[in-house]
């Protein structure tokens, strides 16, 4: 054969959202038969030549990006897609509200708010249940985000976390959950760009806002970092959104 | 007013643990996370985590991370801190203060516990 | 961890005079986003807890007279005391209010002549 071998893929069990002290597996997959796999940590020395690692107690030290290769004969093939594994539970969760409510009727708008006490810049929400794992993910070290074709099919529990660009693979620990309730006709999944544009936002003071308008018009919002994934964690217990108020006593 | 209210001292001997408390009134207790700070002469102040008292939800220092636990009554708006298996190291001021409500600054400090290890 | 350094560790003025002490964080307190500094200002009296004075850098606390003036971006903070009084002998603190775990200064001591 010509050429480099293809690339394998790298995935993370359960999750690549991994609460600090939890356990996560990395596995390299590549064809039958394979010689030999090797499993890097970009950005450091570590490697393996293994095609499974298993980490029983997440750690700080070990977020960030992962690749893997194999060897067959002389031959190695191309990397894998980066994986970038993220230690959740480091800092303090934030808050999630929705403006004007968690209620709202289809047609209408809703205005879902991640605060956070710190100096964070970045922010993730995540819907629970959405099946599909997020793809290129430095496309979403955004403060803005669109959202196309917004139905009533964004109905569910959303969570949201904060983190810092500086360390970007070290999230704080999610926030309580939020049911959103939308009332009226279901239409057609709504799906979100793999490459969305990058506009300026403007903040007041840590927010995120991602603003959901229940229409079947196209409608690009501005938000934070908005990924489909679907963590099994827990670093909090369950309860109603947290608002936050004007500094008062 | 924000009041919270700490006894002035505590002795306490190596080895043992202890509960300081902070009663805090003239606010609405859930709304605001409880900070937990300790002050050794010459050493400065150290942050030793935070409470939010709605959920009693947990945020530490990693470097007092089994040594000091935070809880909060909120039937009686008190926070309390216990810390164990104490050393010398551990002689020091700790305040409690009350977390503004939108950024980590603290707003209102008790008075603070004294607390002496010794024999 | 954010390492906070003050300088200097010690200064004596007289009643009047203008006063002002530094603040160095080891990495940016700038928030991008907002552009605020998450970076605050404590009084601590002698025998006394400590106070808050300013936060985000600049933003005086509620009550706090205007001679209490702070500024600074990034990673050079500095608080001024642009006519000092007599009440004003105390230690100074700076704290980075950017992520946890939260950290200090040493402190700045004011003493009066």
């Known amino acids: 054969q010509s050429g480099p071998l293809p690339k394998p893929s790298l995935q993370a069990l359960p999750s690549s959202l991994v609460p600090l002290e939890k356990p996560v597996t990395l596995r390299c997959q590549g064809p039958p038969g394979v010689d030999l796999y090797r499993l890097e940590k970009l950005s450091s020395s570590r490697y393996q030549d293994q095609a499974v690692l298993f980490i029983p107690a997440m750690k700080r030290s070990l977020a960030g990006r992962y690749r893997c290769s194999y060897q067959n004969g002389s031959l190695w093939s191309l990397p894998s897609d980066q994986l970038e594994l993220v230690a959740t539970g480091v800092f303090a969760k934030p808050s999630l509200s929705a403006q004007p409510g968690p209620a709202v009727s289809s047609g209408g708008d809703v205005t879902l708010q991640c605060q956070t006490r710190y100096g964070f810049d970045q922010f993730a929400l995540y819907k629970e249940g959405d099946p599909a794992p997020y793809k290129n993910p430095e496309r979403w070290y955004r403060a803005s985000f669109p959202i196309i074709t917004v139905t009533a099919a964004h109905s569910g529990t959303y969570r949201c976390y904060s983190f810092s660009s500086r360390d970007p693979y070290l999230w704080s620990a999610p926030s309580d959950p939020l049911e959103l309730v939308v009332t009226g006709t279901s239409v057609t999944p709504s799906r979100l760009p793999t490459e969305p544009p990058s506009p300026v936002a403007e903040f007041s003071e840590a927010t995120a806002e991602l603003t959901v308008s229940f229409t079947n018009e196209v409608f690009t919002t501005e938000t934070s970092r908005s990924i489909t994934a679907s963590p099994k964690e827990s670093d909090s217990p369950a309860g109603p959104a947290r608002q936050y108020y004007t500094k008062g006593n | 007013q924000v009041q919270l209210q700490q006894p002035g001292a505590e002795l306490v001997k190596p080895g043992a643990s202890v509960k300081l408390s902070c009663k805090a009134s003239?606010?609405?207790?859930?709304?605001?996370?409880m900070q937990w700070v300790k002050e050794r002469p010459g050493q400065g102040l150290e942050w030793i985590g935070e409470i939010d008292p709605s959920d009693s939800y947990t945020n530490y220092n990693q470097k007092f991370k089994g040594k000091a636990t935070l809880t909060v009554d909120t039937s009686s708006s008190t926070a309390c801190m216990q810390l164990s298996s104490l050393t010398s190291e551990d002689s020091a001021v700790y305040y409690c203060?009350?977390?503004?409500?939108?950024?980590?600054?603290?707003?209102?400090w008790g008075q603070g516990t004294t607390l002496t290890v010794s024999s | 961890d954010i390492v906070m350094t003050q300088s200097p560790s010690s200064l004596a003025m007289s009643v009047g005079q203008k006063v002002t002490m530094s603040c160095k964080s080891s990495?940016?307190?700038?928030?991008?986003?907002?552009?605020?500094?998450?970076l605050a200002w404590y009084q601590q009296k002698p025998g006394q807890s400590p106070k808050l004075l300013v936060y985000f850098a600049s933003t005086r606390e509620s009550g706090v007279p205007d001679r209490f003036i702070g500024s600074g971006s990034g990673t050079d903070f500095t608080l001024t005391i642009s006519s000092v009084q007599a009440e004003d002998l105390a230690d100074y603190f700076c704290q980075q209010h950017y992520i946890t775990p939260l950290t200090f200064g040493a402190g700045t001591k004011l003493e009066l002549k």
């Open positions: 003239g606010y609405t207790f859930t709304s605001y996370w």
């Open positions: 990495q940016s307190l700038l928030n991008s986003n907002n552009q605020k500094n998450y």
């Open positions: 203060a009350r977390g503004a409500i939108t950024t980590a600054t603290l707003d209102y």
